[in-house]
Every structure is written in structure tokens, then in C-alpha cells.
């Protein structure tokens, strides 16, 4: 990872977006064997610890405060040059979060999308943020930035993501900032998981004892496939969240998850999806829809012994 033409490459791990009180490792990649480097901050709110300091390999900065937000560069050690140092590296912007109330993040048309579609992620707040930033978990590069549009006491920005492919699936958060402190970001929005479907073969969905049951009768939905899915996700039409279970290998070489729905109270249309542990936000094609009908006395809800996942958390591993 070289900056080219005697220029080091400055990077941040795990991310350039750092919470107040957190830590970030700044690494200056220069020529092999030349590990010494110096760091400096470009604006006036300098961090005194850098002055005259020489670092090796990487420098762990923290606990960070608002004073650490800003643009950094490094110079690699060049013992035989006139100055003893290389040309300055690329600029690296460190953003410090937790400085304002969190904005809200929504997905239009929704967080569950087919491969190739486009999703609009709308970040909004009643704090008059000048800029909004969108960041995907696990990504070290700078977040996307948009100017907020202010209407009726609300500031918002629409981030267009797409056409969707597996690399764009994941957990998104957005942040806001005010004009005079562009790198001092708000607390993060609640996480929003963007899931891409349609990448693998569809599983099959069946009901035990059958798709038509008496009110009060116990119902279990089974999702299975010859594909070695690690997790199955069960969704019900009209419900915001899905349920998920670990797939279990069966003797007939299929991989299956059984979702107990409990005593039947009213019907609904169900679908299931499979996913792999390595890519928890990339799902298979949907199973064929399964209509579960309840005869007898339907009530307004179906109790769920399977804990439904929250709006977020889909993209975390099941332990």
C-alpha cells in the first residue's frame, strides 16, 4: 500500500469514524524497512502529543476528544534525504462522533431488496444539521457526505445506494454535523441493516401439520434446502421484523430450520430465505409464499415463542 512517488500512505484502523473516548490506530505505510514516521494535523486545533514525536509502525490515538477531529498527514523517515523525511502523505480525515443528538435513518422502499435494485437511505433530524454522513459498518474509507436540506424544522439528506450488489449489503448508520465543526459528528443513528436477496437458490417452506389448521392448534413452519445455508430467515407479510434460526443438517442431506409459531390464532403469508454466516446480509431468493389459514375463531395476533429480531441485528452473526 504505497502512496507512490515518495509519498507515504496514511490509513486508520478500524475506521476514520471514531466515537468520543474511543481509540484509532493511524498507520503510515512507507517504503519497506522504513517504519519511522511523524504525524501532524493540518488545522489549528493541533494535538500537542505529536510535536517532535517519531512513531514506529502505527500510533494509537485516544481516548479521542473533539480536538482530535480533523485532517492528518504523515511523513516517512528518509535518513539520507535533505530533510530526513519523505513528502507528505495523502490527507486522512478523522471524524469524532457523539457530539450532537442522533439523527434517524430510514430505507425507501425498505431494507429488504433484490440484487440490482436501488435503495434510498434517508437521514433526518430536527437538529439543523448542515451535513449528513452515511457510513457502512466495517468499512475503513471515508463516509459519504451530503448537504442537508431544511424544510419545516427538519434537516434531511437522501443517499442513493445501488445498483445493489453483495458488497453494498450491511449495517448502515448516519451522522450529522454543523457548519463550523464539519468533522465533529453527532451520535450515530440507530443501525439499519440493508439486506440483498436473490443471490442463491430459494429454500422450500412447509407447514406442520399443514397450511390449514384449527384455531389454537400448534403450527411449525419448516424452511429447508439442499444448499448448506447457515441461517434461515422467516418473514410474515405486513410485519416489520423477521425471525431467524440456525440451520440444522438433516439425515437426508438437507439443511433445515423449524420455526414454532405456537397456537394458531390467525393466518398470514410467510416466506423464508437462507443465508451464509460469512455474508449475513446477503440472502437467497425467497421461498414460494406459504399461506397459512386458520379455521375457527381468528383473533388479531399470533403469539410468537420465537424471539423476533429487532429492526437491526440481521447482519450480526448468530452465536
Amino acid at each position: 500500500l504505497m502512496g507512490g512517488q515518495d509519498k507515504p500512505f496514511l490509513s486508520a484502523r478500524p475506521s476514520t469514524v471514531v466515537p468520543r473516548g474511543g481509540h484509532v490506530a493511524l498507520q503510515c505505510h512507507y517504503r519497506r524497512g522504513f517504519n519511522n514516521f511523524m504525524l501532524y494535523k493540518e488545522d489549528r486545533s493541533h494535538v500537542p502529543i505529536f510535536h517532535g514525536r517519531i512513531f514506529q509502525e502505527s500510533f494509537i490515538m485516544g481516548p479521542v476528544t473533539t480536538a482530535h477531529a480533523g485532517t492528518y498527514r504523515c511523513r516517512g523517515s528518509r535518513p539520507h534525504s535533505l530533510t530526513g523525511w519523505s513528502a507528505p502523505s495523502n490527507p486522512l480525515v478523522i471524524m469524532v462522533t457523539g457530539n450532537h443528538r442522533k439523527p434517524s435513518l430510514l430505507a425507501h422502499p425498505g431494507p429488504l431488496l433484490k440484487s440490482g435494485e436501488t435503495v434510498i437511505l434517508q437521514c433526518w433530524s430536527d437538529v439543523m444539521f448542515e451535513h449528513f454522513f452515511l457510513h457502512r459498518e466495517g468499512i475503513s474509507e471515508d463516509p459519504s457526505r451530503l448537504v442537508g436540506q431544511i424544510h419545516d424544522g427538519v434537516s434531511k439528506a437522501n443517499f442513493s445506494i445501488g445498483p445493489l450488489m453483495p458488497v453494498l449489503a450491511g449495517t448502515y448508520r448516519c451522522y450529522g454535523s454543523v457548519p463550523h465543526s464539519p468533522y465533529q459528528l453527532s451520535a450515530p443513528s440507530d443501525p439499519l441493516d440493508i439486506v440483498i436477496t436473490g443471490l442463491y437458490e430459494k429454500p422450500s417452506l412447509s407447514a406442520q401439520p399443514g397450511p390449514t389448521v384449527q384455531a389454537g392448534e400448534n403450527v411449525t413452519l419448516s424452511c429447508s434446502s439442499w444448499s448448506s445455508y447457515d441461517i434461515y430467515h422467516l418473514s410474515r407479510e405486513g410485519e416489520a421484523h423477521e425471525r431467524r434460526l440456525r440451520a440444522v443438517p438433516k439425515v437426508n442431506r438437507t439443511f433445515q430450520a423449524d420455526f414454532p409459531l405456537g397456537p394458531a390464532t390467525h393466518g398470514g403469508t410467510y416466506r423464508c430465505f437462507g443465508s451464509f454466516r460469512a455474508l449475513p446480509c446477503v440472502w437467497s431468493n425467497s421461498s414460494d409464499p406459504l399461506l397459512v389459514s386458520v379455521t375457527g375463531n381468528p383473533s388479531s395476533s399470533w403469539p410468537s415463542p420465537t424471539e423476533p429480531s429487532s429492526k437491526s441485528g440481521i447482519c450480526r452473526h448468530l452465536h
Epitope: R20, G98, N99, R101, V127, M128, E130, P179, H180, S181
Partner: antibody, heavy 115, light 107 residues
Framework: QIQLVQSGPELKNPGETVKISCKAS????????MNWVKQAPGKGLKWMGW????????TYADDFKGRFAFSLETSASTAYLQINNLKNEDTATYFC????????WGQGTLVTVST | DIKMTQSPSSMYASLGERVTITCKAS??????LSWFQLKPGKSPKTLIY???RLVDGVPSRFSGSGSGQDFSLTISSLECEDMGIYYC?????????FGGGTTLEIK
């Protein structure tokens, strides 16, 4: 509607301390930073600094570092400006104003420093 | 610090006249500029933010323009209640800095 109501006028001797309050209503207090602005008699406006009402972190302009202190009582939606060791040149009207572009202002508090 | 130079420092104008006040920043401040009106014994009133956005409740005869370093406030048709002192403010960078003010009086 949004209102910032400041405490009344103060007459102080040099060397004393004054604490001015700015009570906010009509909006979520922690949504907007609070700025403080000085207007000396016959002079223009001078920005003193701001306090982040979400984190409580104050930022002071160079001319207002040392004797000046911003603070908050978030539960009462109130910001404070305290001036220690008052000098004659502190005689001025002090305004609080909220938000990044100073959208709403208090009515001002006149502080007179005189022996 | 960014220096804001406001002109004129004072002016007389007739009722119904079009009035323009200018503000020049010592460096690029994008569009992060506000305009305020001060009247004796009253709270300052914010007229414009982000260089050209009218604050809710401010009469439409007030307008702002400009970006970068050069900005102006225009009153399309002067009314009696418009007399007072006008200030610009840059909020692009800390510390915020005000212009020196323009005293507007009726002829």
C-alpha cells in the same frame, strides 16, 4: 414558540463575579448549541464562544479565555455565562443566541462594572 | 480569524427605496453567512441564514445573496420599521466573526 429569556441587569464592582442565565423554551434544549455574544456600549457585536448543549463542551474565542465560563443546567433548559474578576471593560450587554447561525436571541443582559 | 468587512458603516435612505448592504470575508466562507437586525432595547433579529435563506416570519422584502467571499443584504422597498443596525456573521469557521455593522436611518 422558541424563546430565550435572560436574567436581569447587574451592577457589580471590579473584581467581583457575575453569573447570567439564559432560559430556553419552545424547542429541545440539547438540539442546538448556545452562543454568547457581547455588545459593549457604542460598539459592535463580538462572538464570545459557544457551549455544546448535548455534550456540555464549551469553546471560547481567544479574547474570552480565562475569566469567562459557560455552563448548563440541562434539566432546566438553561445556559449560564459566568464572568470572574470583573473589569471595567466587561461593561456590556451580553446576549445568548441558539443554533449554528444564531437563529434566536435572548433580550440581552446589561452588566455594569463600576466602583 | 476570518475578517468580515461590512459597508457602508452608515447610510440614509428614503421610504420605498431599494437598499443594499455588503459584507466581504477575508477568505472563502462558502455560504455560511447570517444577517441580523438590531434595534435599541430589543432582541437582535435573525433575517437570513446560509447567505440567502429567509428566516420564517421575516418580510419577503429582505433578501440575501452571494457565496464565497462577497455577500449582500437587500431591502427591496424600505419601510419605517427597517431602521436599525445590520450585522453580518460568518459561521463557517471558529471563531465566528461579525461585520462592523451598518446603521440604516430614514431620510
Amino acid at each position: 414558540q422558541i424563546q430565550l429569556v435572560q436574567s436581569g441587569p447587574e451592577l457589580k464592582n471590579p473584581g467581583e463575579t457575575v453569573k447570567i442565565s439564559c432560559k430556553a423554551s419552545g424547542y429541545i434544549f440539547t438540539n442546538y448549541g448556545m452562543n454568547w455574544v457581547k455588545q459593549a456600549p457604542g460598539k459592535g457585536l463580538k462572538w464570545m464562544g459557544w457551549i455544546n448543549t448535548y455534550t456540555g463542551e464549551p469553546t471560547y474565542a481567544d479574547d474570552f479565555k480565562g475569566r469567562f465560563a459557560f455552563s448548563l443546567e440541562t434539566s432546566a433548559s438553561t445556559a449560564y455565562l459566568q464572568i470572574n474578576n470583573l473589569k471595567n471593560e466587561d461593561t456590556a450587554t451580553y446576549f445568548c443566541a441558539h443554533g449554528p447561525w444564531l437563529a434566536y436571541w435572548g433580550q440581552g443582559t446589561l452588566v455594569t462594572v463600576s466602583t | 480569524d476570518i475578517k468580515m468587512t461590512q459597508s457602508p458603516s452608515s447610510m440614509y435612505a428614503s421610504l420605498g427605496e431599494r437598499v443594499t448592504i455588503t459584507c466581504k470575508a477575508s477568505q472563502d466562507i462558502n455560504s455560511y453567512l447570517s444577517w441580523f437586525q438590531l434595534k435599541p432595547g430589543k432582541s437582535p433579529k435573525t433575517l437570513i441564514y446560509r447567505a440567502n435563506r429567509l428566516v420564517d416570519g421575516v418580510p419577503s422584502r429582505f433578501s440575501g445573496s452571494g457565496s464565497g467571499q462577497d455577500f449582500s443584504l437587500t431591502i427591496s422597498s424600505l419601510e419605517c420599521e427597517d431602521m436599525g443596525i445590520y450585522y453580518c456573521l460568518q459561521y463557517d469557521e471558529l471563531p465566528y466573526t461579525f461585520g462592523g455593522g451598518t446603521t440604516l436611518e430614514i431620510k
